[in-house]
């Protein structure tokens, strides 16, 4: 890993290596100052590969609510509103970090967890599966 | 917030309310057992709104490397390979949680931070801005 200079003002840690357990301040700092959330709020409807958003809730996870995209069509929407099936609507997925309460129900102890979420959909050209 | 039953096996905490500072185990648990990363690896090229991926690195952040999508075209790619400027390629953005070292350079102390990342692009029908 990267050698990080130790700051004398850091909280004490017995672990000299990259820590297994760390202290995390949950007062979230939001860096998204320049983005207007209205901008992309209707892409799910205006896209040629539109999607619906489904609420995934888990009180043992932080954040407890995650929205999952499900593509509306198998194909992609043409200018005339009909669906083209020689193209595919596919979900764009991203691995994100969440905090999972561990042990369960503990209010101040978490484990970092990676989960895959579908963020939205895009329209792709299918390719032939060439068998060797 | 949700009242979470206190488990007697939980690490000790002086804070009776939802904690401001918590212990987090950084041994990441990966829940993505059923997903093959090959699947979506080439969507960025096959999409009608293709994108390039740019590496964003920050050693004071966890994860230190995040990939940002930038749409290749203003319009969307047609079946013949030409770009249709009657449609728009737009980034699909998602707010994600990261851990920011705080104080800086400290190996075992973090603050939760929300950042907005562009995951991929989708092709949308532009809308007319109606002036009141």
């Amino acid at each position: 890993g990267i050698a990080i200079p130790r700051n004398s003002g850091c909280p004490n840690s017995e672990d000299k290596n990259f820590p297994r357990t760390v202290m995390v301040n949950l007062n979230i700092h939001n860096r998204n100052t320049s983005t207007n959330p209205k901008r992309s709020s209707d892409y799910y409807n205006r896209s040629t590969s539109p999607w619906n958003l489904h609420r995934n809730e888990d009180p043992e996870r932080y954040p407890s609510v995650i929205w999952e995209a499900k593509c509306r069509h198998l194909g992609c929407v043409k200018a005339d509103g009909n669906v083209d099936y020689h193209m595919n609507s596919v979900p764009i997925q991203q691995e994100i970090l969440v905090l999972r309460r561990e042990p369960r129900h503990c209010p101040n102890s978490f484990r970092l967890e990676k989960i895959l979420v579908s963020v939205g959909c895009t329209c792709v050209t299918p390719i032939v599966h060439h068998v060797a | 917030g949700i009242a979470i039953p206190r488990n007697s096996g939980c690490p000790n905490s002086e804070d009776k309310n939802f904690p401001r500072t918590v212990m987090v185990n950084l041994n990441i648990h990966n829940r993505n057992t059923s997903t093959n990363p090959k699947r979506s690896s080439d969507y960025y090229n096959r999409s009608t709104s293709p994108w390039n991926l740019h590496r964003n690195e920050d050693p004071e952040r966890y994860p230190s490397v995040i990939w940002e999508a930038k749409c290749r075209h203003l319009g969307c790619v047609k079946a013949d390979g030409n770009v249709d400027y009657h449609m728009n390629s737009v980034p699909i953005q998602q707010e994600i949680l990261v851990l920011r070292r705080e104080p800086r350079h400290c190996p075992n102390s973090f603050r939760l931070e929300k950042i907005l990342v562009s995951v991929g692009c989708t092709c949308v029908t532009p809308i007319v801005h109606h002036v009141a």
Epitope: L74, N82, V83, N88, P126, V128, H129 | R39
Partner: antibody, heavy 123, light 108 residues
Framework: EVQLVESGGGLVQPGRSLRLSCAAS????????MHWVRQAPGKGLEWVSG????????GYADSVKGRFTISRDNAKNSLYLQMNSLRAEDTALYYC????????????????WGRGTLVTVSS | EIVLTQSPATLSLSPGERATLSCRAS??????LAWYQQKPGQAPRLLIY???NRATGIPARFSGSGSGTDFTLTISSLEPEDFAVYYC??????????FGGGTKVEIK
Amino acid sequence: EVQLVESGGGLVQPGRSLRLSCAASGFTFDDYAMHWVRQAPGKGLEWVSGINWNSGGIGYADSVKGRFTISRDNAKNSLYLQMNSLRAEDTALYYCARDMGGFGEFYWNFGLWGRGTLVTVSS
Amino acid sequence: EIVLTQSPATLSLSPGERATLSCRASQSVRSYLAWYQQKPGQAPRLLIYDASNRATGIPARFSGSGSGTDFTLTISSLEPEDFAVYYCQQRSNWPPATFGGGTKVEIK
């Protein structure tokens, strides 16, 4: 050997249910979308239903929508078709077919077929 | 729903002859048309996809052409094993796997 083997067909009364299975072997099952296509005796081919690699994309012909359910178990290399509220017009040879799309996506052409299993709906 | 009309319904030819089968779509399917062969008691077999691309292992005597609404499957010189029923199929509009009624190529 690369093959698809259908089973579960038989004689059933109208209104009853039947579950068809298709066992795949000789290829990586979850690399492909899969379909059911049927052929009534002496007639042409009719697409029934399709499912992509991870069951995230599913489609049904209008004639079976709401009555039939397609599913797959990648761990068992198997495709299924649950057929409820069967009608006389569902009588056909049911083929399991492999889509030729890459990455388990739909291409809507069928590069590999099973031998079929016969479903007869009659009182 | 797109309707695919195949003609003729039956084609009577001798081995060695050229077979020309037609498939007409009720509206444009661009080049998204495939051809299948089905012999009695057997499953269909993909011959041509996207109007003119031969599937893996298909002999060069089979060729496809056309776009839009009119398509042709040509068998340059009929072999005894080519006598079968041939179906066309589109993958453009819903339902995305519509088949034609078939053309039977029989021995004269």
